[in-house]
């Protein structure tokens, strides 16, 4: 996160860290807890690393430096990448992770509400992006979970800023004209959440941007409302019933 500040304990209890353990262990992506056994993240996090057993998912944490060999983590039972995601495109950058064991909810570890299907009418004015990603383009992973308040921009405006890419209706963009605040490398898969009528909702999944926090280059997020049918279908068909936070 560029231009952000430290988060507090329990402030974003749905935020998880997706880490890979090969020879060393490192944070690669963020994700959002949406049910006892489900995490929503970006499909591109798994490019080149599709093996379930190399991943460790840490929930209910604030500081990555607090993680030791004794820190509990979740393992992956199943990775469900959107069937239309292609490595040659930037579309459908969404994936579900089914955890091997359900998580208990606590003050520091609980799910985020999902939006209603095809939610286009709600005007979100209080949106935040969180993650442990770089604090500048050529930076490094941060220890303390960062947060930043960023306004949504219209898809029309976003398309003007990204003429060489196709900004679809299944994407949502956020950023300041002058730049300075944005997600960055390592924040991928994490949440863009907006507070509406006193309730936090998962509006976007951190996907991509041209650099980080550059002027007139907003961040681009997968629009969760556009994938509600897919999320419900995959979580229900796998569980028999949807064990996740119901759409708001």
């Amino acid at each position: 996160i560029v231009g952000g500040t430290n988060s507090s304990w329990g402030e974003w209890p749905w935020q998880v860290s997706l880490q890979v353990k090969l020879t060393a262990q490192r944070h690669l992506c963020g994700g959002s807890l949406i049910g006892h056994q489900w995490v929503l993240t970006a499909a591109h996090c798994f490019d080149g690393l599709p093996l379930q057993d190399v991943w460790r998912i840490y929930s209910g944490i604030l500081n990555l430096s607090d993680i030791t060999k004794d820190t509990p983590f979740s393992q992956i039972k199943e990775i469900i990448i959107h069937q239309n995601y292609k490595v040659s495109e930037g579309n459908h950058d969404i994936a579900l992770i089914k955890l091997q064991a359900p998580l208990n909810y606590t003050e520091f570890q609980k799910p985020i509400c999902l939006p209603s299907k095809g939610d286009t009418s709600t005007i979100y004015t209080n949106c935040w992006v969180t993650g442990w990603g770089f604090s500048k383009e050529k930076g490094e992973i941060q220890n303390i979970l960062q947060k930043v308040n960023i306004p949504l921009v219209t898809n029309e405006e976003c398309q003007k800023r990204y003429q060489d890419y196709k900004i679809t209706q299944r994407m949502v963009c956020a950023g300041y004209k002058e730049g300075g605040k944005d997600a960055c490398k390592g924040d991928s898969g994490g949440p863009l959440v907006c507070k509406h009528n006193g309730m936090w909702r998962l509006v976007g999944i951190t996907s991509w941007g041209e650099g980080c926090a550059r002027r007139e280059q907003p961040g681009v997020y997968t629009k969760v409302a556009e994938y509600m049918d897919w999320i419900l279908e995959k979580t229900q068909s796998s569980d028999g019933k949807a064990q996740m936070q119901s759409p708001a």
């Epitope: 040659s88 890419y165 041209e210």
Partner: antibody, heavy 125, light 108 residues
Framework: EVQLLESGGGLVQPGGSLRLSCAAS????????MTWVRQAPGKGLEWVSY????????IYADSVKGRFTISRDNSKNTLYLQMNSLRAEDTAVYYC??????????????????WGQGTLVTVSS | DIQMTQSPGTLSLSPGERATLSCRTS???????LAWYQQTPGQAPRLLIY???SRATGIPDRFSGTGYGTDFTLTISRLEPEDYGTYYC?????????FGQGTRVEIK
Amino acid sequence: EVQLLESGGGLVQPGGSLRLSCAASGFTFSHYLMTWVRQAPGKGLEWVSYISPSGGHTIYADSVKGRFTISRDNSKNTLYLQMNSLRAEDTAVYYCARVAQGIAARSRTSSVDQWGQGTLVTVSS
Amino acid sequence: DIQMTQSPGTLSLSPGERATLSCRTSQFVNSNYLAWYQQTPGQAPRLLIYGASSRATGIPDRFSGTGYGTDFTLTISRLEPEDYGTYYCQQSSRTPWTFGQGTRVEIK
């Protein structure tokens, strides 16, 4: 299956014009950046031009700027290259190609992932 | 413009040998925009590696790419008969997009 089929090449005199077409199929054409790359006989690859998915943004190599125009018709899944004021040094096989733009670590990637078989343009008197 | 310099110009190797091809750029190139292509006579180029190190769909794992900044490498761990041809590196980090002059891999 992705297919790119160029047409319109041939022999033309210096100063003449030619219009190349590229019919695309097997993918959502309107979502992709498209490009033309050429290769003079026995030489290496040279990028010519690209066009944004909507067609609203075009970039050219200095060697063709002001003479060549790239365009597209997304309703017909077709890419074009209008070549005017042709010179002997424009003699080459012209490839129509698709630009893949994936995502890696919150950035986009870019590479030319699908190529047509090429059409030969010969500029000679 | 970003100049791409490939070396060697020609590489003469036997099947089963390891091939190491170099690509140097005149300016910093974002790795996400560095690709390698293979071309055999009379054929269109074929994408091998994108993002400096990711194999394109269907490309065997004997092909690998590494590098950062201005120095990139394509390695073919064990040459197969179908690997002979000309290899090009290319950057699309900045316009104009540029290709290297190519490295020809020939049978020894």
